[in-house]
Amino acid sequence: GEGRKTWRRRGQQPAPAPLPPQRTEAAPGTGQPVESFPLDFTAVEGNMDSFMAQVKSLAQSLYPCSAQQLNEDLRLHLLLNTSVTCNDGSPAGYYLKESKGSRRWLLFLEGGWYCFSRENCDSRYDTMRRLMSSKDWPQTRTGTGILSSQPEENPYWWNANMVFIPYCSSDVWSGASSKSEKNEYVFMGALIIREVVQELLGRGLSGAKVLLLAGSSAGGTGVLLNVDRVAEQLEQLGYPAIQVRGLADSGWFLDNKQYRRTDCVDTVTCAPTEAIRRGIRYWNGMVPERCRSQFKEGEEWNCFLGYKVYPTLRCPVFVVQWLFDEAQLTADNAHLTGQPVQEGQWLYIQNLGHELRNTLKDVPASFAPACLSHEIIIRSHWTDVQVKGTSLPRALHCWDRSLHDSHKASKTPLKGCPIHLVDSCPWPHCNPSCPTIRDQFTGQEMNVAQFLMHMGFDVQTVAQQQGLEPSKLLGMLSSGS
């Protein structure tokens, strides 16, 4: 059966602990807090557990009312401007956890696919109403992964102001339509982001130094579609000093040929390019202006593809993408279903990894592990995966350093602080730090060699193709080289 991913902690090597983190200090003569750099993990990557315990106890002792401050909950705020709504006309909103001492703001766009016709939006409304309506949203949400305020779970930005924006527009955060007679649903994804930013200015965002617009899956694509517009909005409102950046997780899709062509009937089977083509019309979808101008009318769907929109963006964007993304494979009808795969499907999957790697060649800030998975940044164990020995929070920290006091990425990477991290091994889970795979029927954990054989992978044939002894290949697979 198909393996399934869970997360495991990696073995830790001891390393010397660095200086403790600083909170904030007043800039001379201004009374304004100046936030120190994120922690520099150069020396600590191995011995994270004991280091984080020290950081946490220090944070608690330094922070007034620390027990309250370490409450993980983000609180729901429905938009005051009730004309900006979810699909069903209920008000959109956001969850917020303020961090008074910080000038960093993290705005996270939730994912959850899309719908692109009356029929499949009806079905979505009937079975996933939370993604189309705010009527039953809970009053609080727990921040996890990059949204966590616990330094051991979020060594990157644990002290930031955290904002989770629920996805209730089903339009990949692109829509700018309003209620009309002919439309049963409204699609306001782009307008929701704009309104959230507008309302957050009154809640402290106006004093921000950095706004990081992050998102996973459809939210990751939403980052690519909206990051420049957010920067422009803040500039126009008189906040040009706020540095706007993007973090797109699992939203970098390819318009490759489907493994098996299917008719565009529903969200699950429709080829993504066709779904987006139809969707843009249905949603009145907006794409970044600089990208739109490169394509003729009716071809705006191209701007939903990371590798086409990215070169047109002005804001720095960090791209996180599994080389074997499950949503891409689902859209390509090449997903693994627990049955051994055919050789053609195996080659298709390998080729997907190769193509994706190529599209990231010129993306200076990227993290792309050779794993079969989907989404990472709000998983609790997002710190576990490494590419070339570097974890994602560490890579993001290096990216921050490379951008320090500048809107553009520095051309020369910082020594010992890499930001372009793309796996070069060719198979799903050839990276040993990938999320654990479990056998779909027994629930047993599998190593990569077991997984590949389980998938019908022919060790003899592949060893021959690679010019290796089968035993050598199995050894390499097990060690992840």
């Epitope: 939006c121 079905s123 409304y125 009937d126 079975t127 996933m128 699950v268 627990g338």
Partner: antibody, heavy 116, light 107 residues
Framework: DVQLVESGGGLVQPGGSRKLSCAAS????????MHWVRQAPEKGLEWVAY????????YYADTVRGRFTISRDTPKNTLFLQMTSLRSEDTAMYYC?????????WGQGTSVTVSS | DIQMTQSPASLYVSVGETVTITCRAS??????LAWYQQKQGKSPQLLVY???NLADGVPSRFSGSGSGTQYSLKINSLKSEDFGSYYC?????????FGSGTKLEIK
């Protein structure tokens, strides 16, 4: 209070037909998807059919496609399941259920026995 | 079609214990999963939707977790009223198949 009440069950000969009804009250019927789910004696739940809110698009399980027809009469707040060419394996308790996020309300069920 | 493999098929436990029931999908269902409880001779009742969200009125001792293809329902400190059968169901494209069920019985 949301209520779903099924009716129309009973004993049917193999090859025969039966029409089940589900009367809905306490909510805006047109705003929810409606499903039929069945449970054979001492067995698990089996999803049978679904009609969407709004457009009324229809979906069936392979085991009943071509033999069963789901429909709704929105003004009368009623869901139907027309069953034809019945087989012994269709013997089950038939439930109607409403969906928004999961099947959040179920009727008490109506029993259908297919036997000669 | 997506298959849902639920385990264990039955579980003998005492009041006060904690139990976990798992459900595996044959492919990624992107958290579009619900859990139901059914007591003998009664209709099923929704417990969890969207893999992790507790339905209205469900006690907080119930919790859902998981993503991708593997999901679980955890019941902390079991009460006598928690005994019965539990089913998972996916909503990622029709047919919306159920798991085969887990019968929770008193030890």
């Amino acid at each position: 209070d949301v209520q779903l009440v099924e009716s129309g069950g009973g004993l049917v000969q193999p090859g025969g037909s039966r029409k089940l009804s589900c009367a809905a009250s306490g909510f805006t019927f047109s705003s929810f998807g409606m499903h039929w789910v069945r449970q054979a004696p001492e067995k698990g739940l089996e999803w049978v059919a679904y009609i969407t809110s709004g457009s009324g698009a229809i979906y069936y399980a392979d085991t009943v496609r071509g033999r069963f027809t789901i429909s709704r009469d929105t003004p009368k707040n009623t869901l139907f399941l027309q069953m034809t060419s019945l087989r012994s394996e269709d013997t089950a308790m038939y439930y109607c259920a409403r969906s928004a996020d999961g099947l959040d309300y179920w009727g008490q069920g109506t029993s259908v026995t297919v036997s000669s | 079609d997506i298959q849902m493999t639920q385990s264990p098929a039955s579980l003998y436990v005492s009041v006060g214990e904690t139990v976990t029931i798992t459900c595996r999908a044959s492919e990624n269902i992107y958290s579009n999963l619900a859990w139901y409880q059914q007591k003998q001779g009664k209709s099923p009742q929704l417990l969890v939707y969207g893999a992790t969200n507790l339905a209205d009125g469900v006690p907080s001792r119930f919790s859902g977790s998981g993503s991708g293809t593997q999901y679980s329902l955890k019941i902390n400190s079991l009460k006598s009223e928690d005994f019965g059968s539990y089913y998972c169901q996916h909503f990622w494209g029709t047919p919306f198949t159920f798991g085969s069920g887990t019968k929770l019985e008193i030890k």
